[in-house]
Amino acid sequence: GSVPPMVNVTRSEASEGNITVTCRASSFYPRNITLTWRQDGVSLSHDTQQWGDVLPDGNGTYQTWVATRICQGEEQRFTCYMEHSGNHSTHPVPSGNSHHHHHHHH
């Protein structure tokens, strides 16, 4: 069977006026997954995102991440889109200093 991913969105200061937002998916099986940032509902160009490899996390499941840099104050226009084993979900950027948003999808 399949194990749905835990999705976690974090933000960190990148440079003046910019932040890096990272979307991590973990503890999922099988390894096929779509993880991408969307701006105003449209997937960002590939050249503006950085992806981590899909790696085993030691429990027979997998983990990966995608990150992009955005302007501070425009967080509400960005969402992380996850698709796995026919299920999908969108995850907002946490506001302010809230660093972790965990969502488990069934």
């Epitope: 105003d40 449209v42 997937s43």
Partner: antibody
Framework: DVQLVESGGGLVQPGGSRKLSCAAS????????IHWVRQAPEKGLEWVAY????????YYADTVKGRFTISRDNPKNTLFLQMTSLRSEDTAMYYC??????????????WGQGTTLTVSS | QIVLTQSPAIMSASLGERVTMTCTAT???????LHWYQQKPGSSPKLWIY???NLASGVPARFSGSGSGTSYSLTIGSMEAEDAATYYC?????????FGTGTKVEIK
């Protein structure tokens, strides 16, 4: 009032070039993504190209990729579509359309009146 | 690219009749990224149903939308004269974005 006014259409020979413009007013142009959508005579809508508010993300329909270039000049509130290697099948009414963001939903909420491009010898 | 095929291409309906049209995608589309637009001759398209099943502002309650994956539909519960128009589905799940082929609804 939100207004989008296209211009630049006309008669062009096959293989020729043309640049369409879309002048925006009544809203903060620099905060909205904009699309070009076309409609051939008596045909359906065909999405052509998209440019995000900050020009960071640009996409094209497969039918125009490599021939058309979308761009914008935010200080001048203007959107452009540079078209090259034009074909008869590019004959259509070209609309610019604003991509709204409202309550987490994105959609076309305002359209121009269109400009007609005819590609013929 | 995701191709959206609408059927029927043209349909005639009597006033009061129930009307259903479909939009079939060549690969799965999230319902969040599937909208329907209505267009009347000489006018720009208007958002009609968003995210597969939500009526846009001002759209009569006789309209409804449903579906998931590769199959979506728009239904008019009881056809009225003002509903005569062409309806297009539109997806932005994957780029390039695409519109459906359109369904023209006429009054019989």
């Amino acid at each position: 009032d939100v207004q989008l006014v296209e211009s630049g259409g006309g008669l062009v020979q096959p293989g020729g070039s043309r640049k369409l413009s879309c002048a925006a007013s009544g809203f903060t142009f620099s905060t909205f993504g904009i699309h070009w959508v076309r409609q051939a005579p008596e045909k359906g809508l065909e999405w052509v190209a998209y440019i995000s508010y900050d020009s960071r993300t640009i996409y094209y329909a497969d039918t125009v990729k490599g021939r058309f270039t979308i761009s914008r000049d935010n200080p001048k509130n203007t959107l452009f579509l540079q078209m090259t290697s034009l074909r008869s099948e590019d004959t259509a009414m070209y609309y610019c359309a604003r991509w709204a963001y409202e309550g987490g939903v994105n959609y076309f909420d305002n359209w121009g009146q269109g400009t007609t491009l005819t590609v013929s010898s | 690219q995701i191709v959206l095929t609408q059927s029927p291409a043209i349909m005639s309906a009597s006033l009061g009749e129930r009307v259903t049209m479909t939009c079939t995608a060549t690969s799965g589309v999230s319902s969040s990224y599937l909208h329907w637009y209505q267009q009347k001759p000489g006018s720009s398209p208007k958002l009609w149903i968003y995210s597969s099943s939500n009526l846009a502002s001002g759209v009569p309650a006789r309209f409804s939308g449903s579906g998931s994956g590769t199959s979506y539909s728009l239904t008019i519960g009881s056809m009225e004269a003002e509903d005569a128009a062409t309806y297009y589905c539109h997806q932005f799940h994957r780029s390039p974005l695409t519109f459906g082929t359109g369904t023209k609804v006429e009054i019989k």
